[in-house]
């Protein structure tokens, strides 16, 4: 029943051409291509995006014209590589364009940069957005899907458009308000903190299917998809999952044009047959095609239904557990993880697959013994333990992010992970903590039915970010550890790691403790960056300082700025006061 | 697609022995516990004898304890049943199976009389 299965095409540039339409090819051709060379100026990758096009449409015009029959990577790969200053740009990237495909798609591939090296995207005043808005509309959106692709390389692409539509949307609607900057900043604000977390998301599905492999994003999908839409059955959860896998694969491979065009398959055909998957589709299969897969994706879960039996008959009870282990293992535990996960939409995905490893390993511990029953008969059992570990710490970080605020439960954490990594650099440190933190206000209103859910699996994609980082730049044993033993037990891994007592502290220095008057006008969320940026200083300077003495420094320091900021002479308030700042801090430290 | 096919059944004399044998395809045979089983006509399953993956741990039923022997050749896939002293309550249709569990075969006749 696959729904992607489809005739060989002479031209496959003129096939997704015709299936996408001029415009969402041009857009997702754009985004390809800014993903791949992420440092080229938007003029010259508007360039390419025009000569593939006219390219595509001759091919329409006739699929036998020449070189209409090679494949998209040949296509786009031969496009990449006409770039003049490939070698002075993107350094040994430009030795890819050496290889023949599929290797030359794999090369780029693997410099695609999770930190670019680009400027901060700076808001413009909204008047000067509006004036370039009305100028050039379709410029101004190409520009918008070339500055978030070349700054998030794994980015869905199908839903960047989606984004892009609501941008749109956003500043039709907006600049002939009478308030414009009312109108339109708090939905820039939210579209940028979607975007965030969107592509966050994305790249742990990345990481999941490139570091992993394809078993492990099944076995995900299997848990998630149970989970959302526990009436429909085995087998068409595992036809959804094979064809999710399909499209993620495609889309983190740089298949930008056939991931579309499948996803678009797959939501036609979840809507087509919603009611063998769920019954929360309804208004998602009412809107136009972007609009439909997004809310497909984030659909709520279905009601479970009522009169599921006890798992133990199947699982434990039955004298053909082996034997049906035995005739298709992965189907077996398939079958155990979505009989699990459609009963529990309380328990995070993480943790179903953490039960899954623990039946798998059981099993084959059992099966090969003389009475397989008698070995695993408490296979449950030895489920207790890895069920109660993420409540206990949901349990006691939710009383935490309550009694501190956000702010301080990022501090906290802050100084925990630096304890632990100290070798990170800052930077990463402070980003991934702060967004760590963010599980409180993101999670810990939910009721206890999901709270697991909403935190554990949010933390899955926080610390990606952090492996993806690293992986960069690798600096520490422990960080490379915990990112690549176990993919479901990274969480653990990390919550697991005590204060690092090999870490020799760093030298003090005081320029790293001195600030400006500039920070006075900073947002409040760039203020309090400043301040966690010093405050990881502060831990590797002194890793052993305890709560109560940075807690101390920290307080000095708020009032430092404070008292500061309201100074008639700022800058000369920064250079006396931040020397006595300094200095007391040295002495309650010890340093 | 699992495929377990036994031999070796026949008609004995009481007293009388037989070696059966189980031959074992499409599943990793040397991860798995087997076990032989067999149905006496109007009866039901009875378990007769299990062997670990490894054969380091043999079990046998009462009933025939000190007469038959498990064996395994993880390398031909094949799991044995020597059966010495064999006696008429011994008849019955012999089924390997995967761990205890339930036959997927047609089994071997193995009828004890005089």
């Known amino acids: 029943r696959g729904v992607f299965r489809r005739d060989a095409h002479k031209s496959e540039v003129a096939h997704r051409f015709k299936d996408l339409g001029e415009e969402n090819f041009k857009a997702l051709v754009l985004i390809a291509f800014a993903q791949y060379l992420q440092q080229c100026p938007f003029e010259d990758h508007v360039k390419l995006v025009n000569e593939v096009t006219e390219f595509a449409k001759t091919c329409v015009a006739d699929e036998s014209a020449e070189n209409c029959d090679k494949s998209l990577h040949t296509l786009f790969g031969d496009k990449l590589c006409t770039v003049a200053t490939l070698r002075e740009t993107y350094g040994e990237m430009a030795d890819c364009c050496a290889k023949q495909e599929p290797e030359r798609n794999e090369c780029f591939l693997q410099h695609k940069d999770d930190n670019p090296n680009l400027p901060r995207l700076v808001r413009p005043e909204v008047d000067v957005m509006c004036t370039a808005f009305h100028d050039n509309e379709e410029t101004f959106l190409k520009k918008y899907l070339y500055e978030i692709a070349r700054r998030h390389p794994y980015f869905y692409a199908p839903e960047l458009l989606f984004f892009a539509k609501r941008y749109k949307a956003a500043f039709t609607e907006c600049c002939q308000a009478a308030d414009k900057a009312a109108c339109l900043l708090p939905k820039l604000d939210e579209l940028r903190d979607e975007g965030k977390a969107s592509s966050a998301k994305q790249r742990l599905k990345c990481a999941s299917l490139q570091k992993f492999g394809e078993r492990a994003f099944k076995a995900w999908a299997v848990a998630r998809l149970s989970q959302r839409f526990p009436k429909a059955e085995f087998a068409e959860v595992s036809k959804l999952v094979t064809d999710l896998t399909k499209v993620h694969t495609e889309c983190c491979h740089g298949d930008l044009l056939e991931c579309a065009d499948d996803r678009a398959d797959l939501a036609k055909y979840i809507c087509e047959n919603q009611d063998s998957i769920s019954s929360k589709l309804k208004e998602c299969c009412e809107k136009p095609l972007l609009e439909k897969s997004h809310c497909i994706a984030e659909v709520e879960n279905d009601e479970m239904p009522a009169d599921l039996p006890s798992l133990a008959a199947d699982f434990v009870e039955s004298k053909d557990v082996c034997k049906n282990y035995a005739e298709a293992k992965d189907v077996f535990l398939g079958m155990f993880l979505y009989e699990y996960a459609r009963r529990h939409p309380d328990y995070s995905v993480v943790l179903l697959l953490r039960l899954a490893k623990t039946y798998e390993t059981t099993l084959e511990k059992c099966c090969a013994a003389a009475d397989p029953h008698e070995c695993y008969a408490k296979v449950f059992d030895e489920f207790k333990p890895l069920v109660e570990e993420p409540q206990n710490l949901i349990k006691q970080n939710c009383e935490l992010f309550e009694q501190l605020g956000e702010y301080k439960f990022q501090n906290a954490l802050l100084v925990r992970y630096t304890k632990k990594v100290p070798q990170v650099s800052t930077p990463t440190l402070v980003e991934v903590s702060r967004n760590l933190g963010k599980v409180g206000s993101k999670c810990c209103k939910h009721p206890e039915a999901k709270r697991m859910p909403c935190a554990e699996d949010y933390l899955s994609v926080v610390l990606n970010q952090l492996c993806v980082l690293h992986e960069k730049t690798p600096v520490s044993d422990r960080v490379t550890k915990c990112c690549t033993e176990s993919l479901v037990n990274r969480r653990p891994c990390f919550s697991a790691l005590e204060v690092d007592e090999t870490y020799v502290p760093k030298e003090f220095n005081a320029e790293t403790f001195t600030f400006h008057a500039d920070i006075c006008t900073l947002s409040e969320k760039e203020r309090q960056i400043k301040k966690q940026t010093a405050l990881v200083e502060l831990v590797k300077h002194k890793p052993k300082a305890t709560k109560e003495q940075l807690k101390a420094v920290m307080d000095d320091f708020a009032a430092f700025v404070e008292k500061c900021c309201k100074a008639d002479d700022k800058e000369t308030c920064f250079a006396e006061e931040g020397k006595k700042l300094v200095a007391a801090s040295q002495a309650a430290l010890g340093l | 697609q699992v495929q377990l096919a036994e031999s070796g059944g026949g008609l004995v004399q009481p007293g009388g022995s037989l070696r059966l044998t189980c031959t074992a395809s499409?599943?990793?045979?040397?991860?798995?516990?087997m076990s032989w089983v067999r149905q006496a006509p109007g009866e039901g399953l009875e378990w007769v004898s299990a062997?670990?993956?490894?054969?380091?741990?043999?079990r046998y039923a009462d009933s025939v304890k000190g007469r038959f022997t498990i064996s395994r050749d993880n390398a031909k896939k094949m799991l044995y049943l020597e059966m010495n002293s064999l006696k008429s309550e011994d008849t019955a249709v012999y089924y390997c199976?995967?761990?205890?569990?339930?036959?997927a075969s047609q089994g071997t006749q193995v009828t004890v009389s005089s």
């Open positions: 199976v995967i761990g205890r569990g339930s036959p």
């Open positions: 062997i670990s993956a490894d054969s380091s741990d043999k």
């Open positions: 499409g599943f990793t045979f040397g991860s798995f516990g």
